[in-house]
Amino acid sequence: SGVFQLQLQEFINERGVLASGRPCEPGCRTFFRVCLKHFQAVVSPGPCTFGTVSTPVLGTNSFAVRDDSSGGGRNPLQLPFNFTWPGTFSLIIEAWHAPGDDLRPEALPPDALISKIAIQGSLAVGQNWLLDEQTSTLTRLRYSYRVICSDNYYGDNCSRLCKKRNDHFGHYVCQPDGNLSCLPGWTGEYCQQPICLSGCHEQNGYCSKPAECLCRPGWQGRLCNECIPHNGCRHGTCSTPWQCTCDEGWGGLFCDQDLNYCTHHSPCKNGATCSNSGQRSYTCTCRPGYTGVDCELELSECDSNPCRNGGSCKDQEDGYHCLCPPGYYGLHCEHSTLSCADSPCFNGGSCRERNQGANYACECPPNFTGSNCEKKVDRCTSNPCANGGQCLNRGPSRMCRCRPGFTGTYCELHVSDCARNPCAHGGTCHDLENGLMCTCPAGFSGRRCEVRTSIDACASSPCFNRATCYTDLSTDTFVCNCPYGFVGSRCEFPVGLPPSFPW
């Protein structure tokens, strides 16, 4: 669709005569008839296939034609067409004399024609005017013409319809060739697709308007590129939603079981070495001079009975000192000047001479030790207490002080963690080496079955058309991630087919 525009500029008829040569009385009151038609090699009479237009009387004899387009007048003349512009045309312009006010063809005498011009040729659509001048024996007509497209029509032949819009169906303006030019923030064939916030994750994020980033279930962050771990995950991370991958030193479904008590709590005192031995379990290896489960107790250096042969020990600031009995010398009274004749063996020990009487050895009765049988046997030296229990000498016997969770003479028995029925909601308790485990009935979870869990909203496969289903643990609902071409809360509607709602 477009318009052929003809702008009449000047008509010269100096003698004021008709085509027949007869003069007009009193002068030639001139108006024009225009016929636009398809291209003819020789322009001949016949239907004006592209349209006709007539002017009022524009002047007498010779006159210039005023441009009336701005004032809503009829110059340039408009010849609209509702078809694809073919690029060629034939144009006939007739100048007529109007003796009276009636300009209809049937009201005019046949000899009222002043002049007739006919042209044909090629004409491309465009804003530029083509100037032409046609001269006959008695008259001269100067004019210009062009073809332009109607509003919303574009292209070389005004065949492309394009109407700018900014609504649900598109966000664009039209280029000179009729192609769409998307408004900022929109893309796609019809500019219906918003351009999301720069960097918004292609799979995990989406947008409904430009420069936003909405996260799909299980994702968060400005660009929807951070996964949300499993609800209840304490010391863990995720690489996909609802995972709980434990940090170093943590274990269990929710990464809440401390497998590295040593690092997280530093229980061993006074420079002792800590060794992990299971969940919340550890052993401290004390430095010399310290004792206790956590090496919190300072030992007197004389407690280890370093003085031999009945020597008495004295604590000093920088260590200890042995006071040796007669016949012995050395740092620990370990050297003897005695022989069996001096009866050096205490507590009923029997003396045996060595090296031709230059030396001796004592054979001690049970419960005594030392080179002179001077020491009672310390039943704790063999570390008989298991599971980090503390050994205590009690006269002729010994006993073990056990750490929490252990019992028995040597702390060798693990107290059943299940004895106190720790599993809630009818969970089944299982004793493990380093604790317990609860097997929960349906609908409950957590270390002690204390968490009431919702039914997996995706279990019923609510999403259609191969959509991906996500369970939002915080709301107990499902969300369907639709494949391309489907919409709806369950991805049940193909794009382009509006859903039929009951209202």
Partner: nanobody, 123 residues
Framework: EVQLVESGGGLVQPGGSLRLSCAAS????????MSWVRQAPGKGPEWVSA????????YYADSVKGRFTISRDNAKNTLYLQMNSLTPEDTAVYYC????????????????WGQGTQVTVSS
């Protein structure tokens, strides 16, 4: 059930300070980004500040930058907003929220909201 309970609002003079708290329950607080949103009388909700799940990244609206500080204590399941140099324009109901979507300046869609706490700045 997700619950967000704000506290710490009140009447304060221009130039004064307030500290808002948001106690969270019903979800693993330390796994979620959090945000503060406010709504002045007769106006729409306005994003104020946001913080990522670990607390290492913080974001502020231009109107509060340099005056407000967002922080969180994951061990206590609590979100905070320290507001200094308050002006009458800061008068609003302040909400703690879990963001679901972001725009060019900050969060603008939310999965959950608290019930809000009123902050009034007036002499």
């Amino acid at each position: 059930e997700v619950q967000l309970v704000e506290s710490g609002g009140g009447l304060v003079q221009p130039g004064g300070s307030l500290r808002l708290s948001c106690a969270a329950s019903g979800f693993t607080f330390g796994s979620y980004d959090m945000s503060w949103v406010r709504q002045a009388p007769g106006k729409g909700p306005e994003w104020v500040s946001a913080i990522n799940s670990g607390g290492g990244s913080t974001y502020y609206a231009d109107s509060v930058k340099g005056r407000f500080t967002i922080s969180r204590d994951n061990a206590k399941n609590t979100l905070y907003l320290q507001m200094n140099s308050l002006t009458p324009e800061d008068t609003a109901v302040y909400y703690c929220a879990i963001p679901r979507g972001w725009g060019p300046t900050g969060p603008h869609e939310y999965a959950y909201w608290g019930q809000g706490t009123q902050v009034t700045v007036s002499s």
